[in-house]
């Protein structure tokens, strides 16, 4: 109440940029906190299917839009066939997970590995077997699976036949695919993510053309895609809530990614307003319909009136509250390259703690899973990834401060990524794994980097001990 009254803001995220130490929820003077995370804090690590599985056409897998995009748009990358070959070396992934001692493993299912043309008929047996074996092995190890249904690898057939996410026909097709996954894997999966970072799917897939399918320049398509992604997520949530939750007793969300931004002049109201616009145009675009009032943020509706689709009253009601927790991604993909439209002439910042505070204020202090966090190193860096450790310590410190000092309800943390792999438009020029993989080797051994040892220690101590 005090915060709202003093700042003049209506309790929304703009209060974060107020530098009055009495009223800003983030106390900058607390630079490092030696403390532990809450008991039973959920420690995990993640991968994306297209990034690590390899075997892009092996055992009946169909091509994805990214397989096609790699062959047509990315220079000097023949395929993801090299990658870390997780499809072949599943046991090596499991050993890596054992080494770190995580509570959960977040991975995605390759839609075209299960259904080569995207349509749910008879599943590809080898694909089904792969995911089933993985899940069984995780359960055996007491590692909770967090399963993402869509991490950007749309079956190419759906792109070619329907225009992909631009066409609302895909909403029902995605729901059919989700239903199949719930039916086949739901007995072993208690945490589901529908879509990973829809902002990047829409913005880079249809705006900049830097992601598959590589379309560019059509703002109406960008927001139509975003609209269909939100509606697809909502449909799947309702499906799970009605038909599967009663007996599977799991949780379902969508991973939303964002940058963070600071005003050029902290005392300047217009700069603060631009920072708010920046966050709203990236994170609010998807969070407001799902975690907020069921509609797009008002500023977006005004500014983008000619390209932003509308939700009917019934749809607003349907969208609202369709996430059981706030899954948040904070990593390089939302920073480089940053949409200049989103930057609003302000300064980008890696302050995860402030981003979490913004979410708290905007969306009524939800339970938060950090669903992707980490940084990257140059591809030449092997196992001595000191920068990655520095970044991890910094990020984890910010999460801990958010929990202990700001009373933000973060319940889990996903380090990204388990393995070096294919890094989207950056291909193999950067590495994000806690385990080093020599992509040119036959056996693709997973070698723990310094960051893997560091993360292992953090998990063992449940935080930072003096």
């Amino acid at each position: 109440i005090l915060l709202r009254a003093v700042t003049g803001f209506s309790g929304d995220g703009r209060a974060i940029w107020s530098k009055n130490p009495n009223f800003t929820p983030v106390n900058e003077s607390q630079l490092f906190l030696y403390d532990t995370f809450p008991k039973n804090f959920f420690w995990g690590i993640g991968t994306g299917a297209l990034q690590v599985e390899g075997s892009w056409k092996k055992d009946g897998k169909g091509p994805s839009i990214w397989d096609h995009f790699i062959h047509t748009h990315l220079k000097n990358v023949s395929s993801t066939n090299g990658s870390s070959d997780s499809y072949i070396f599943l046991e090596k992934d499991l050993s890596a997970l054992d080494f770190i001692g995580v509570s959960f493993y977040q991975f995605s299912i390759s839609w075209p590995r299960l259904f080569p043309d995207g349509i749910v008929t008879v599943a590809n047996a080898k694909g089904l077997q792969y995911y089933s074996t993985l899940l069984d092995a995780l359960v055996l190890r007491n590692i909770e699976p967090i399963v993402t249904l869509y991490h950007w690898d749309l079956p190419l057939a759906l792109q070619e036949k329907y225009g992909g996410w631009k066409n609302d026909t895909i909403i029902d097709i995605f729901n059919d695919y989700a239903t199949y996954c719930f039916q086949m894997f739901g007995d072993r999966v208690k945490y589901w993510i529908t879509i990973h970072n829809p902002y990047l799917v829409a913005w880079h897939g249809y705006g900049t053309g830097m992601h598959a399918p590589g379309e560019k320049g059509n703002l109406a398509a960008v927001y139509t895609v975003g609209h269909n992604l939100i509606k697809a997520h909502s449909k799947v949530w309702h499906n799970y809530n009605t038909h599967f939750r009663p007996h599977q007793k799991g949780w379902l969300s969508i991973t939303l990614g964002s940058h963070w931004i600071e005003p050029n002049r902290s005392e300047n109201t217009m700069d603060i307003f631009k920072c708010q616009q920046s966050m709203v145009s990236v994170l609010g675009w998807f969070a407001n319909p799902i975690h907020g009032d069921g509609d797009y943020p008002e500023g977006m509706r005004k500014k983008l009136f000619s390209v932003l689709p509308i939700f009917s009253e019934a749809e607003k009601h349907e969208m609202r509250g369709t996430a059981d927790f706030f899954a948040f991604s904070f990593g390089p993909n939302n920073f480089k390259p940053l949409n200049t439209m989103a930057k609003m002439g302000q300064n980008v910042s890696l302050n995860l703690r402030e981003a979490l505070n913004w979410i708290k204020l905007e969306y009524n202090n939800p339970r938060i899973l950090i669903a992707e966090n980490g940084w990257f190193t140059d591809s030449r860096v092997k196992t001595e990834d000191t920068t990655a450790i520095y970044m991890m310590k910094n990020f984890l410190s910010q999460v801990l401060q958010a929990i202990r000092l700001d009373e933000i309800r973060v319940f889990g943390y996903t380090a990204w990524s388990l393995l070096d792999g294919f890094e989207w438009q950056d291909a193999y020029t950067i590495r994000r794994g806690l385990f080093y993989v020599d992509f040119n080797s036959k056996q693709k051994e997973r070698k723990p980097k310094s960051s893997a040892h560091y993360y292992k220690q953090i998990i063992r101590e449940n935080g930072f001990s003096l």
């Epitope: 703002l219 005004k302 000619s306 509308i310």
Partner: antibody
Framework: QVQLQESGPGLVKPSETLSLTCTVS??????????WSWIRQPPGKGLEWIGF???????NYNPSLKSRVTISLHTSKNQFSLRLSSVTAADTAVYYC???????????????WGQGTTVTVSS | QSVLTQPPSVSAAPGQKVTISCSGS????????VSWYQQLPGTAPKLLIY???KRPSGIPDRFSGSKSGTSATLGITGLQTGDEADYYC???????????FGGGTKLTVL
């Protein structure tokens, strides 16, 4: 103060193409919050929106006129133009150019209008 | 046939109050923002109300706007003879992807 001024022929023959230009002063046609617009008003009738163009080059046109309309920006001259092909007597009207504006704060609508230019379609 | 529906005419005596209605649907007024325009005889239209209920500088507070559901209303109090004009409502229609106007309402000050 932002001002718009329409210019072009007052008489066009049926089946020909109507061409009008709008010169902008006090604002830039490459400004990000503006949609540069054309509206017309047939004699004794109401306003009819023809279409607009955003600085990025994206256009929206009245569905009933879409097949005949082209709006384009000329940033170097700070102008925008209208072309309406295959005109008939039904296209006789006062043609206005306008600035349609919306930003994060406010949805303004058509906040600046030109004075209008009368175009008659007749042989 | 206009997408937005306005009464063709309204009238009232000087000093009185008058309201002009504008009715639409969820794809236009219901989910977008309404502007009102005044067109004095022989002149170009002028923005009177924007963003449902805001007045541009120079527009007296005798003019007000409101919106409820799929309808909008323009109110004019303290009528003056100089208010005699045609009044148009306008908004964006998300289904048509077009700006739409009402048919116009002729205000006569008796």
């Amino acid at each position: 103060q932002v001002q718009l001024q329409e210019s072009g022929p007052g008489l066009v023959k049926p089946s020909e193409t109507l061409s009008l230009t709008c010169t902008v002063s006090g604002d830039s046609v490459s400004s990000g919050d503006n949609y540069w617009s054309w509206i017309r008003q047939p004699p004794g009738k109401g306003l009819e929106w023809i279409g607009f163009m955003f600085y990025s080059g994206s256009t929206n046109y009245n569905p009933s006129l879409k097949s005949r309309v082209t709006i384009s920006l000329h940033t170097s001259k700070n102008q925008f133009s209208l072309r309406l092909s295959s005109v008939t007597a039904a296209d006789t009207a006062v043609y206005y150019c306008g600035r349609y504006r919306s930003d994060w704060d406010y949805y303004y609508g058509m906040d600046v209008w030109g004075q209008g230019t009368t175009v008659t379609v007749s042989s | 046939q206009s997408v937005l529906t306005q009464p063709p005419s309204v009238s009232a005596a000087p000093g009185q109050k008058v309201t002009i209605s504008c009715s639409g649907s969820s794809s236009n007024i219901g989910n977008n923002y309404v502007s009102w325009y005044q067109q004095l005889p022989g002149t170009a239209p002028k923005l009177l109300i924007y963003d449902n209920n805001k007045r541009p500088s120079g527009i007296p507070d005798r003019f007000s706007g409101s919106k409820s559901g799929t309808s909008a209303t323009l109110g004019i109090t303290g009528l003056q003879t100089g208010d005699e004009a045609d009044y148009y409502c306008g908004t964006w229609d998300s289904s048509l992807s077009a700006v739409v106007f009402g048919g116009g309402t002729k205000l006569t000050v008796l």
